[in-house]
């Protein structure tokens, strides 16, 4: 037991799962039910987080670590430590103050969360649109229009196949 250090600051010896109890001459007391301390030297134990309503428990509280929450199906976490749950939308939609709304033409969202984003502008990279965009998917850019002009192809056509076993005439 580190008695020399405890003479200087008795609280520094209190391990995680306990607190330094001023009501008991600063002895280390285990955290009361439904509270925790995740580090040593604490003067109080923190009340365990309760995952209620739209939150559900991902990890139970213990005397040394807080509960962790996530969101019930149909919702997703926002903020540090899942401090909020936000409603999911379908792909091709975004959440507005009035609920889930389809992405406007020229925008897409391939997730159940987040906002609709503009389709990629292929021409900015000197390319052409290979596959058109939808509410759920971005456009797919292909080669530049110049690469597709007649005579510009660098691909040589394959030689005609010969039937096996026949010698040329």
């Amino acid at each position: 037991f580190e008695r020399t250090r405890s003479l200087q600051d008795p609280c520094s010896n209190c391990p995680a799962g306990t607190f330094c109890d001023n009501n008991r001459n600063q002895i280390c007391s285990p955290c009361p039910p439904n509270s925790f301390s995740s580090a040593g030297g604490q003067r109080t134990c923190d009340i365990c987080r309760q995952c209620k309503g739209v939150f559900r428990t991902r990890k139970e509280c213990s005397s040394t670590s807080n509960a962790e929450c996530d969101c019930t199906p149909g919702f997703h976490c926002l903020g540090a430590g899942c401090s909020m749950c936000e409603q999911d939308c379908k792909q091709g939609q975004e959440l507005t103050k009035k609920g889930c709304k389809d992405c406007c033409f020229g925008t897409f969202n391939d997730q159940k969360r987040g906002i609709c984003r503009p389709w990629t502008n292929c021409s900015l990279d000197g390319k052409s649109v290979l596959v058109n965009g939808t509410k759920e998917r971005d456009v797919v850019c292909g080669p530049s229009p110049a690469d597709l002009s007649p005579g510009a192809s660098s691909v040589t056509p394959p030689a005609p196949a010969r039937e096996p076993g026949h010698s040329p005439q």
Epitope: P30, C31, P32, P33, N34, E60, S62, S63, T64
Partner: nanobody, 111 residues
Framework: AVQLVESGGGLVQPGGSLRLSCAAP????????IAWYRQGPGKQRELVAW???????HYVDSAKGRFAIWRDNTKKTTYLQMNSLKLEDTDVYYC?????WGQGTQVTVSS
């Protein structure tokens, strides 16, 4: 506050073992948090081991690997098994739950 009753202390040689018991009176239900402390003459009470409210056993560094705490809820008794005892383990040992304390049991390690 209810009175807890410790027993099992005594004189033991270095390297020996003791098992301390802490019994709660029959009129209370199981104790959710229970701890063992030690106290030497003129010293502060120091935590040794405890069973937390989540039923997990915890130990201070000097007790890890040598001491074991567990409880038998049917007997309303908590035990502290002390192995590989050292001279410096000599102290009065108390059990505690909330505001309830035992009278203490003396553990003396001497050759």
């Amino acid at each position: 506050a209810v009175q807890l009753v410790e027993s099992g202390g005594g004189l033991v040689q270095p390297g020996g073992s003791l098992r301390l018991s802490c019994a709660a009176p029959g009129n209370i239900s199981s104790l959710r948090v229970i701890a063992w402390y030690r106290q030497g003459p003129g010293k502060q009470r120091e935590l040794v081991a405890w069973i937390a409210w989540d039923d997990i056993a915890h130990y201070v560094d000097s007790a890890k690997g040598r001491f074991a705490i567990w409880r038998d809820n049917t007997k309303k008794t908590t035990y502290l098994q002390m192995n590989s005892l050292k001279l410096e383990d000599t102290d009065v040992y108390y059990c505690n739950s909330g505001d309830s304390w035992g009278q203490g049991t003396q553990v003396t390690v001497s050759s």
